[in-house]
Each structure stands twice: as structure tokens, then as C-alpha cells.
């Protein structure tokens, strides 16, 4: 059986302080312990929670913790449940409140000789003791002009007189602590000869050229005087009006009327009431000229169907604050529904494609009206008008792949070739409607293409394979002029490609057949040993069934390739002497010789007096200078081949002969003696 070792007991507690209701049980089986408050299970919160089997209070609350607490233990195995005795808190607390007028019903009814009762709304447990104050000074209980009822928390003034006027406050204390009134009461018992406000002027906002009215009334015995004054202290009367208030009228009841208001009339107006005795009462009211600023324009907005979207109206500043509303197709939007207005916001709870259009935000006040349109586009996922198709494109011609889609807004189309983005260049162009143009189709354009059409709402894609229909062409085209070396083996290749593999063959241009030492092996012309007779015009013919035939004409020249009879040697020359660089070449056709010195070709027509190239090809340089030093290249060329050979030229100072060097001494360099 379940036994309580410790049961919760009733106890004193302080509002907002810690407390603990103890409960300890003993049972043979595991026991589930929970708490009831007034018979209802207690849920754990940060403030009040189970701590083991006890109930802990971080901060006692007089409202939430009043009542009977019970500790309940339940044996999970046997189903037995027992409850502790009830325990409750005696919660001590004190709470501040205002001083309020209990009698008469309103301040307006307070007159001299009236009985006035004030109540102190400080409450607590145990019942607090109260102390009243006027202007911070404690009121004693023994004065004949007032009575204090602690039980009722009341202060009664009988009868009220002007001497009772002042700020009334109260404080109270009990076992918990002390509190003072949260809001005090100002008692004003008027002297009848003092001016009192009956009607105070209010701030006014008017549009230019409209009229403005200020009301003002005082009362006193005898009746008080009333005067209106504008900002600069200029009095306003029907007899003497300041120049800028020519259209002002003061009525007998104290109201001030301003007609056809201008900006200079805006400002503070003071209504001054003066009784027979007492200070003047000055009441202020401001005349504002209505104004409204311009509205900022909207950026066009693109939204995705199905989303919740909001557009905030850039409401203009204005006086009075402009009222703002949204319209669509000239109809104001409702406060509720799928599309509605909430404050300054245009709200689409779930935006739909049909919501595309122009929405207008209006702002209006006395000064006028402003409006701004916002263009709202609800993006849709593109749909196909024409997908790219697998295509056969002809080599060398323009090729087109279509990717026609429609959506809102206009979709953007990008193309991929072999998974690589196609950037527009001289060969590829993407038109506005998404069509890809390949300006001149090449063989390697035969691959997989993919187009992606997108809007903010999503994208679609499709792919197509391009097969290139090859031109019948020579690959590469044979050189129209070619040379063969006399008495040597030579080959002249000719190959072609097309939609079908073409047959390639050689013929002589004059129609005569190839000699037996010349063979045509699948387009390669082979000369076992070139003779002079092999020179001439030859035609390579490539043909296949679907494309016909193509021809390439080649002129073959038989030549003796160039060799050097004499090559220039490494030469050292004294400055001022003449250098001779010899070079002779032979070949058929007879080679021409050119020289290159210091990395530029020496033009025979522009050599000047110091340099000369002989008929046999040798180069002579007179009066050599150090800057002539360098590498010289002899280039021999004819229509069939070109060869070159080079040698360095070094120009040195002539040495001064020393005594030790007799005529028999060898020169320091191998010289050309000139």
C-alpha cells in the first residue's frame, strides 16, 4: 500500500517569493506522483513545477496559487491511488493602485461647499493600514475638515473649499510591505471669481483657402473676459485685426473664425480667460495648413503563382495623415479575402496568374490626392510552342534549332551544347524567340543540344540531337602547286570526306594515263623515281553516289632541290676594312639568293654604298663598323624549296703594334686581308 511519509501542509507565503509544498511517499512498486489544485491536475510551468514528488513555486502568485493543493500518488502496477490532505497558502501581498474620485461622480461637479470623497485603491492581504497626503504632507486623523475611514480606504472632505485644493496621494502597509498610490488625484476646488475652462480650443488642420474655427469658453462669477492672441502676441478683435488676419471674426460666445486660410495664418492661437480674481488661463491651439507629399514610384514586381505576396504602399507624408487605399481596375480592395488590403499593404494570400495587372495605391487628405501604379506580373512556368527536334543540318550552311515557349514574363532561353553553355559568338546566335542559329554548320556541330526556357516561376527544357550532313570535300584540299625532287621518290596525297566515304583517284589533266612507275593508291599518287616528264597538271577526283564528284587541280613541278656550292664562313674583320661573305647555291629552277643580317632581310635596292650583293650571291661590306657585327644568313630559294646557312661576322679594332711584336708575330685573329 502507498504511505505518505510527508504530506503537504498549509503555510504562509509572500507574493512573488519562493515556496515549496512537500510530499514524500513510500510504496512497494514504482509510484507516479502528481498534484491537484482544486481537483484539477497541475501542469508544470517555469513558475510552478514538480521537484521530485514535491511541488516547487519559483514565485507565488496570489491568483494562480489560491485554493486547495493535493499530492496524489498512483501505483503503476496495482492501480492504487491515494491523495494527501489539502494544503493551501495564506498569501501575503500588497498592490498599488490609483487615488480616484468616489464622490461626486465627476470632477465637473466639484463645487465649493460640496462633500468630496477620495478612495485609495491600494489593496492587500492582510488588510493594509492607510495614510493620506496632500501635496506630500501627511493628513492627521483629528482635523475637523476631513475624515479618514481605513476600512473603506476613503478620505472625505466636508465641505470642500478652495483651501482643500492640491495633489492627493496615499500609502499603505501590511505584513507584506508598503505601497503608494500609482496615480494621484489633483483636487481643484475653484473660487467662483476665478476663470474656469468650459470649452477649450482644439488644434485644427485645414486646406488652403478653407475656413477654420476655434471654440473657447470660460466661466466665472462675475463673467470673465476672453481675448484671442496670435503667435506674435498681436491681439485679435473685431475692431483691430493684424494685417495678416484681416479675415478673422471673434464671435460673442468666444469662438474665433478664420476665413480663406493662407500659409501665413498657420501657427499657435492663444485664448486667454481672466476672472475677477486669480491668474489668467491661457489655452493654446494650433492651426496647421494641410499638406501632402508626392509618392515614390514602384518598381514593377514579378511574383510566383501560389505564394503569399505583399506590396507595401510608399504612403506619402502629410497633414492630416493621409488615408491610404489600394485599387485594382478602379475598384478599392476589401479588408478580407484572397486579395485584400491590410494597413499599407496589398496582400495576396495566394497569388494567382489572373492577378497579373496594374494596382494603384491612393493617398488622400485635405490637401489633395496622390496615386502610384504598380505593375504586378505573376510569373508562370513556360509552356512549349515548339520543342527542338532531332535535326539533319547541312555542313557549311546555316542551321536552326527551335525552342519556342510562352510564359509570363517573356521567358529567357539558354542553349547548351554537349552540356556546355553556348555563348553567342560569330557562329552561334540565339534569336529573341529562343531559336538557335548555327551560322555555318561544321562537322563537329553534330552533337546533343539542350535548351532551357525559364521564368522566375520555373523552367522547362528539351534536347535534340544534330546530325551533320557532310559536304563532299577534300580534307585537306591539295596544294595547287607542288614540287617533287628530281630522281627521288615522291608522294602526292589527296583525301576527301562526304556523307558516304568517297572514292578518290588521280588523272593527268590532259587525259593521258599515269606511267607504270606512278601508282594511285586510294588517292595517294606515288612516284617511285621522279623524272622530268612527271611534271605537269594532275587532277584529283573524289566522288560518291549521293553527292557526285569534286575535282582538285594540282600543278606538279620537278625540281633539283637546292644545295650550297659555297657557304659563308665565320669571319673576323678589322674596323674600316672590307668583309666578304661568300655564298653560292645551285638547283633547278635556279635559286635566288637573299641575305638576312641582324634579323632583317637586306633589300638589294636599299643597301647603300657600303653593302653589295654579287651576281653569284656573295655579300660584300665595305668600311665595316662594330655595329655590323652579328649573324648573317644566306637564304637560297626557288619555287620548290628554300634553304639557308649562316655565319657570324665579328668587327674588331685594329691592334697597336708593340716593340715586342716583330713583323714575324702572328696576328691575334684569323683575318681577311684586304
Amino acid at each position: 500500500a502507498i504511505v505518505f511519509i510527508k504530506e503537504p501542509s498549509s503555510q504562509d507565503a509572500l507574493q512573488g517569493r519562493r515556496a515549496l509544498l512537500r510530499c514524500e511517499v513510500e510504496a512497494p512498486d514504482p509510484v507516479h506522483v502528481y498534484w491537484l489544485l482544486n481537483g484539477v491536475p497541475v501542469q508544470d510551468t517555469e513558475r510552478r513545477f514538480a521537484q521530485g514528488s514535491s511541488l516547487s513555486f519559483a514565485a507565488v502568485d496570489r491568483l494562480q496559487d489560491s485554493g486547495a493543493f493535493q499530492c496524489v500518488a498512483r501505483d503503476n502496477v496495482t492501480g492504487e491511488e491515494v491523495r494527501s490532505t489539502n494544503a493551501s497558502f495564506n498569501i501575503k501581498w500588497i498592490e498599488a493602485g490609483p487615488v480616484v474620485l468616489k464622490h461626486p461622480a465627476s470632477e465637473a461637479e466639484i463645487q465649493p461647499q460640496t462633500q468630496v470623497t477620495l478612495r485609495c485603491h491600494i489593496d492587500g492581504h492582510p488588510r493594509p493600514t492607510y495614510q493620506w497626503f496632500r501635496d506630500g504632507t501627511p493628513l492627521s486623523d483629528d482635523q475637523s475638515t476631513h475624515t479618514v475611514s481605513s476600512r473603506e480606504r476613503n478620505l472625505t472632505l466636508r465641505p470642500a473649499s478652495p483651501e482643500h485644493s492640491g495633489l492627493y496621494s496615499c500609502c499603505a502597509h501590511n505584513a507584506f510591505g508598503q505601497a503608494c498610490s500609482s496615480q494621484n488625484f489633483t483636487l481643484s476646488v475653484a473660487d467662483e471669481s476665478f476663470a474656469r475652462v468650459v470649452l477649450a480650443p482644439q488644434d485644427v488642420v485645414v486646406a488652403r483657402n478653407e475656413e477654420a474655427m476655434f471654440h473657447c469658453q470660460f466661466s466665472a462669477q462675475p463673467p470673465p473676459s476672453l481675448q484671442w492672441v496670435f503667435e506674435d502676441e498681436t491681439p485679435i478683435t473685431n475692431r483691430s485685426r493684424p494685417p495678416h488676419l484681416r479675415r478673422a471674426v471673434v464671435f460673442a460666445n468666444g469662438s474665433l473664425l478664420l476665413t480663406q486660410v493662407r500659409p501665413r495664418n498657420a501657427g499657435v492661437y492663444r485664448c486667454i480667460g481672466q476672472g475677477q480674481r486669480g491668474p489668467p488661463i491661457v489655452l493654446e491651439a494650433t492651426l496647421h495648413l494641410a499638406e501632402i507629399e508626392d509618392m515614390l514610384p514602384f518598381e514593377p514586381r514579378v511574383f510566383i503563382a501560389g505564394d503569399e505576396e505583399r506590396v507595401t504602399c510608399p504612403a506619402p507624408q502629410g497633414l492630416p495623415t493621409p488615408s491610404v487605399w489600394w485599387e485594382h481596375a478602379g475598384v478599392p480592395l476589401p479588408a478580407h479575402g484572397r486579395v485584400h488590403q491590410k494597413g499599407l499593404e496589398l496582400v495576396f494570400v495566394t497569388i494567382a496568374e489572373s492577378d497579373t495587372g496594374v494596382y494603384t495605391c491612393h493617398a488622400s487628405n485635405l490637401a489633395g490626392q496622390r496615386r502610384q501604379d504598380v505593375n504586378i506580373t505573376v510569373a508562370t512556368v513556360p509552356t512549349w510552342l515548339r520543342k527542338p527536334q532531332d535535326s539533319q543540318l547541312e555542313e557549311g550552311k546555316p542551321g536552326y534549332l527551335h525552342c519556342l515557349t510562352q510564359a509570363t514574363p517573356k521567358p529567357t532561353v539558354i542553349w547548351y551544347r554537349n552540356q556546355m553553355l553556348i555563348s553567342e559568338d560569330s557562329r552561334f546566335e540565339v534569336s529573341k524567340n529562343g531559336t538557335l542559329r548555327i551560322n555555318s554548320v561544321e562537322v563537329y556541330d553534330g552533337t546533343l543540344y539542350r535548351c532551357v526556357s525559364s521564368t522566375p516561376a520555373g523552367s522547362i527544357e528539351a534536347q535534340a540531337r544534330v546530325q551533320v550532313l557532310e559536304k563532299l570535300k577534300f580534307t585537306p584540299p591539295p596544294q595547287p602547286q607542288q614540287c617533287m625532287e628530281f630522281d627521288k621518290e615522291a608522294t602526292v596525297p589527296c583525301s576527301a570526306t562526304g556523307r558516304e566515304k568517297p572514292t578518290v583517284k588521280w588523272v593527268r589533266a590532259d587525259g593521258s594515263s599515269l606511267p607504270e612507275w606512278v601508282t594511285d593508291n586510294a588517292g595517294t599518287l606515288h612516284f617511285a623515281r621522279v623524272t622530268r616528264d612527271d611534271a605537269g597538271n594532275y587532277t584529283c577526283i573524289a566522288s560518291n553516289e549521293p553527292q557526285g564528284q569534286i575535282r582538285a587541280h594540282v600543278q606538279l613541278t620537278v625540281a633539283v632541290f637546292i644545295t650550297f656550292k659555297v657557304e659563308p664562313e665565320r669571319t673576323t674583320v678589322y674596323q674600316g676594312h672590307t668583309a666578304l661573305l661568300r655564298c653560292e647555291a645551285q638547283g633547278d629552277p635556279k635559286p635566288l639568293i637573299q641575305w638576312k643580317g641582324k634579323d632583317r632581310i637586306l633589300d638589294p635596292t636599299k643597301l647603300g654604298p657600303r653593302m653589295h650583293i654579287f651576281q653569284n650571291g656573295s655579300l660584300v661590306i665595305h668600311d665595316v663598323a662594330p655595329e655590323d657585327s652579328g649573324s648573317y644568313t644566306c637564304i637560297a630559294g626557288n619555287s620548290c624549296n628554300i634553304r639557308h646557312t649562316e655565319a657570324p661576322l665579328l668587327v674588331v679594332d685594329k691592334p697597336v703594334m708593340e716593340d715586342s711584336e716583330g713583323p714575324g708575330s702572328p696576328p691575334p685573329y684569323k683575318m681577311i686581308q684586304t
Partner: antibody, heavy 113, light 111 residues
Amino acid sequence: QVQMQQSGAELMKPGASVKLSCKATGYTFTGYWIEWVKQRPGHGLEWIGEILPGSGRSNSNEKFKGKATFTADTSSNTAYMQLSSLTTEDSAIYYCARGKLSWGQGTLVTVSA
Amino acid sequence: DIVLTQSPASLAVSLGQRATISCRASESVDSFGNSFMHWYQQKPGQPPKLLIYAASNLGSGVPARFSGSGSGTDFSLNIHPVEEDDSAMYFCQQSKEVPRTFGGGSRLEIK
């Protein structure tokens, strides 16, 4: 010793109500929770709810709210479970148990048109 | 609701060997220092019988061959050595929260 004696088998029409009883002996009836469990072939065991006879307090499975109502008569030490708006889905063996240890023999309810 | 997942759904164990059944809870069933997880055995035509209560406590009159372990969300029932009479359905149940929920059951067969 603790015993839980349940009422006999019931054959009911769809839409009808049935009240099952569970008589407890051998312990203080008011201080122990009585639990009700449903068993359908191939559906395992389902906890329907429980009642503490002394206070009349009960807890039930949300799934059976509106289907099962628990009461107890302390004078006869008997707990009751009423099943309303019967359907073929309610065909099952219903057990009562005091805690986890002492189970009744079960009552077979068959709902058939 | 706390969901209890039992595994395996069925097992066949040779006489004298060990049988282990697992039960996993969708959230912790620990409270007041106890694990409120219990194990039952049920044979055809009979009501369930309490084997283990509060995860590891042996029920009244239950042989010591049965043992339970685990805390929080993972629990297991062990039978060793298995006897012919142990052929039955086994269920786990949590009583931490209303509704008290049962596992789907595990059928033990003796080979």
C-alpha cells in the same frame, strides 16, 4: 485474493450500444484504477481508458472518445464500459484490469448485421 | 501519443537458448526516477500476464529466466534459457502518459 469477473459474450447489431461489466473482489474497490483494453485478432492490444471508482475520475484514449464511456458502482464494486454506435470494427475481446496485475477473463463482443 | 515499436515481429529459438525482444519508444518513458515500461506474455485464449514492470522488476510468480532492461526509449526483454512453455505472444506497454500504449507484439516459437 484480487479477482476481476467480466460479463458474458455479446452479439450485437451495427448501430446498437452495449454495456460491459467488470466485478471486482478481494480489495478496496474505490482506491484503485480500473483499466479497459481492446484486443482484435491481428491488431494487438489497444488501451481504451481507465476509471478511479472512488472519485469517478477517468482518462481515455482520444481514439475512443465518443465511443467508450466509463462508470463505476461502488455499492456493487462493479465497473462498467458502455460502447455506443457499434460497427464491425468494434468486434473484439474487451478486458478490464486492476492496474497491470489483475486482469478479467475478457468479454467477446461480436457486431454483425 | 507515445508510439512503441517492437522487434522482431516473430522469432524462433531453440530450447535452452536465449530469446531477446526489443521495444523502442518514440519518446522517453522515464519519470520520477523510474522507466514506466512493462512487459506482458499472452497465450491463446488467456488475458495478458505481467512479466516485468518498470523496465526491470520481475512480476509476482514470474520465473527468474525472464529479465528486462533499458531506460529512456530503448528496452529489451530477455528469456534464458528458453523453455517449451514460453511459446506465446509478448507485448511491451508504457504507462508514463495517457493514452497508455502497447507495442505491436512479438511471437516466440520454440524450435
